[in-house]
Amino acid sequence: MMTGTIETTGNISAEKGGSIILQCHLSSTTAQVTQVNWEQQDQLLAICNADLGWHISPSFKDRVAPGPGLGLTLQSLTVNDTGEYFCIYHTYPDGTYTGRIFLEVLESSVAEHGARFQIP
């Protein structure tokens, strides 16, 4: 039975040209995390594998940095980066947990962080 929950940074905003950290945290489970995938819609941004370490997808390696922790840093943001981001935790024996973050990239300096929320 899957007992874990994923806490994410929720709905967040950031300025064009700036950077943002996407963070998820898996709690309430003793399952072993074997790999975390970071995806934007159906595009893979990066993975962090327990054995193999980090690997950034070729098309994002100039603008994506691993960490902190299992999080992901997006740099040189453009308005095209606005959208949904998913952290997908592959765990054993539980299976897959998915967290969602919505990022809005703003032209002006009114970027503010939204509230955290949980996805069971």
Epitope: Q35, D51, L52, H55, S57, H90, Y92, P93, G95, T96
Partner: antibody, heavy 119, light 106 residues
Framework: EVQLQQSGPELVKPGASVKMSCKAS????????MDWVKQSRGASFEWIGR????????SYNQKFKGKATLTVDKSSSTAYMELNSLTSEDSAVYYC????????????WGAGTTVTVSS | QIVLTQSPAIMSASPGEKVTMTCSAS?????MHWYQQKSGTSPKRWIY???KLASGVPTRFSGSGSGTSYSLTISSMEAEDAASYFC?????????FGAGTKLELK
């Protein structure tokens, strides 16, 4: 053209070791993972392990821990697999394959290296 | 580790016939991938992420499924489709293949 060029067939004696190579060309070697897969005669496939060429870190199928060792030479875009303490059970075709990062499938395969263990 | 059972093990089809082969997983998996292999050659990625066709694969092929049940379908069999087809999955602690379905031309 994206290619994985594997070393030639090997005939080895029981108890010996063998090291085979897989040279990548036509793509940036460090942008992908490299995997090794065993196909026994007339049988299906067994995944042996995966290598991250950026840092040399590896992930193995539990069954092949202690049997296979995966290494890399980034400068020549070449992955290697060494098999030790060979027995007749190790006679097979061994493929290197380019591994997808997230979904763990194999989009490019080498031609395979045939290993025959016989006294 | 997750066991993949392919059925049938061997099948034959006439040109123009619809072909369906299945891959059953012992536990739920998120994605299934399929490879085509012809005798004496290395496998080719055929269908990935359950339903996406690899580059160069004819559109008569399709893949579907979810959970523990997946399938590969050929809408109209052609001679060049005679080959062995293997399913493959990765879950958190294992990467496994099915034993294959050998498709012959009738």
């Amino acid at each position: 053209e994206v290619q994985l060029q594997q070393s030639g067939p090997e005939l080895v004696k029981p108890g010996a070791s063998v090291k085979m190579s897989c040279k990548a060309s036509g793509f940036t070697f460090t942008d992908y993972f490299m995997d090794w897969v065993k196909q026994s005669r007339g049988a299906s496939f067994e995944w042996i392990g995966r290598l991250n060429p950026n840092n040399g870190r590896t992930s193995y199928n539990q069954k092949f821990k202690g049997k296979a060792t995966l290494t890399v030479d980034k400068s020549s875009s070449t992955a290697y697999m060494e098999l030790n303490s060979l027995t007749s059970e190790d006679s097979a075709v061994y493929y290197c394959a380019r591994g997808d990062l997230g979904r763990w499938y194999f989009d490019v395969w080498g031609a395979g290296t045939t290993v025959t263990v016989s006294s | 580790q997750i066991v993949l059972t392919q059925s049938p093990a061997i099948m034959s089809a006439s040109p123009g016939e619809k072909v369906t082969m299945t891959c059953s997983a012992s536990s739920s998996v998120s994605y299934m991938h399929w490879y085509q292999q012809k005798s004496g050659t290395s496998p080719k990625r055929w269908i990935y992420d359950t339903s996406k066709l690899a580059s160069g694969v004819p559109t008569r092929f399709s893949g579907s499924g979810s959970g523990t049940s997946y399938s590969l379908t050929i809408s109209s069999m052609e001679a060049e489709d005679a080959a062995s087809y293997f399913c493959q999955q990765w879950s958190s602690n294992s990467l496994t293949f099915g034993a294959g379905t050998k498709l012959e031309l009738k």
